[in-house]
């Protein structure tokens, strides 16, 4: 029978670490991480890490009992967890009978939004105490709410990932810019900022009709030339406060009729939060 892996949590040091080993298996040949989605009962879905590793093809594989994988996550707070994946059979060949290296994977480490993860793996038995054993590590940065997969997560939807404000902005005259955008039921307070290398104007927008989408309009006084300036719209939603996903547009000249001219209505920029 071909070996498979059975993985389970192992928080402390492996028991083999306390034993003296004359010989140990070699290091891993490759270690990779990619995110995968799984459905959860709430109708939402979770993102998990698919950690896959390739064993080195030589006789030292015969000593291999398990591979231990540890993940450290760094974002607002630090997390650390490990799993030990035991091989169900001893290896009788250095490569798979059908050809190619022995490759295994574990799906289970949860992925938070916009987090840097350090994934390390080593074979067991590993080096003796006070010795450096062969190990392999990779970094993985999980995407934020602007990612095409992540944006449908409930947490991201509540932070406005699916909201398209369809910003239009035009220069009415030398002193004012008119900004129009579509509101969202997610919140009722917005900040519109006009930037042309420096901030040349801003305005708070309060939209009382929070429960329905409406088209809001605000005229913003400016202190410099506004044509070609950037409009940044920052929403204030309960879930993300002042660090919600920001959206951008560009100021153009108003048509003679005074109707704002739409441009760049799909540009989005994450705030400092990026949930």
């Amino acid at each position: 029978r071909e070996p498979t892996v059975q993985c389970g949590s192992e928080t402390g040091p492996s028991p083999e670490w306390m034993l003296q080993h004359d010989l140990i298996p070699g290091d891993l040949r490759d270690l990779r991480v990619e995110p995968v989605t799984t459905s959860v009962a709430t109708g939402d879905y979770s993102i998990l890490m698919n950690v896959s590793w390739v064993l080195r093809a030589d006789a030292s594989i015969r000593l291999l009992k398990a591979t231990k994988i540890c993940v450290t996550g760094k974002s607002n707070f630090q997390s650390y967890s490990c799993v030990r994946c035991n091989y169900t059979e001893a290896f009788q060949t250095q490569t798979r009978p059908s050809g190619g290296k022995w490759t295994f994977s574990y799906i289970g480490f949860p992925v938070e939004l916009n987090t840097v993860y350090f994934i390390g793996a080593h074979n067991i038995p590993n080096a003796n105490m006070n010795e450096d054993g062969p190990s392999m590590s990779v970094n993985f940065t999980s995407p934020g709410c602007l990612d095409h997969i992540m944006k449908y997560k409930k947490k991201c939807v509540k932070a406005g990932s699916l909201w398209d404000p369809n910003i239009t902005a035009c220069k009415k005259n030398e002193e004012t810019v008119e900004v129009n955008f579509t509101t969202t039921p997610l919140g009722n307070r917005y900040m519109a900022l006009i930037q042309h290398s420096t901030i040349i104007g801003f305005s708070q927008v309060f939209e009382p009709h929070q429960k329905k989408q409406t088209r809001a309009s605000v005229v913003i006084p400016v202190t410099g030339d506004s044509e070609g300036a950037t409009v940044q719209l920052t929403p204030y939603f309960p879930t993300c406060g002042s660090d919600c996903i920001r959206h951008k547009g560009t100021v153009v000249l108003c048509p003679q009729t005074g109707v704002p001219f739409p441009l760049d209505n799909n540009k989005s920029k994450p705030g400092g939060w990026l949930p």
Epitope: D22, L23, G26, A57, D58, A59, S60, R62, L63, Q92, T93, Q94, T95, R96, P97, S98, G99, G100, K101
Partner: antibody, heavy 118, light 107 residues
Amino acid sequence: QVQLVQSGAEVKKPGASVKVSCKASGYTFISYWMNWVRQAPGQGLEWMGRIDPYDSEIQYNQKFKDRVTMTRDTSISTAYMELSRLRSDDTAVYYCARSGGFDWFAYWGQGTLVTVSS
Amino acid sequence: DIQMTQSPSSLSASVGDRVTITCRASENINSNLAWYQQKPGKAPKLLLYDVTNLADGVPSRFSGSGSGTDYTLTISSLQPEDFATYYCQHFWGPPYTFGGGTKVEIK
């Protein structure tokens, strides 16, 4: 049955290159590493390196690392070993040898004599 | 690299004799050892692998033993077709190395 058939004898001048082929049959070519071993006249056996036909991973003996190139063509189940910048002490019989479950050499080609002489 | 030292480098024996060849590795090779027989002008032939396992078609008069760094090939009753050169080889990870060979000649 498993067979490894190598290309014929070669005579080369110092500084030249030689490419030896090894055609495998009787088993799934991509399932086993292919090794190259040489034997100078009246001398012992010397492992040069190995190639995994599945993905072309190669491991060389450091002694030959700068001069040897191992390749394979899975479509015709053939492995190749090219040795460059030949010297007179490269005169030897070159063997391809298929690994077993691990790297014992269960099957050998008939050998290719490469003579390097000016 | 692991060095393989074979002894003796040559020996003379008669048909029916018991012959023993030893092989010492410069470090523990965890029983990852093979033995080959080679006759003049021919490719080597695998005799034993994993110290004790006979390769296909190899007569049972050939046997192997040992562990760690020290290994032995024994021919229990030498036959005329056994006069050849014998090599040990470790396969405890590349680079693989062979012993210098033992030539078994007719006394």
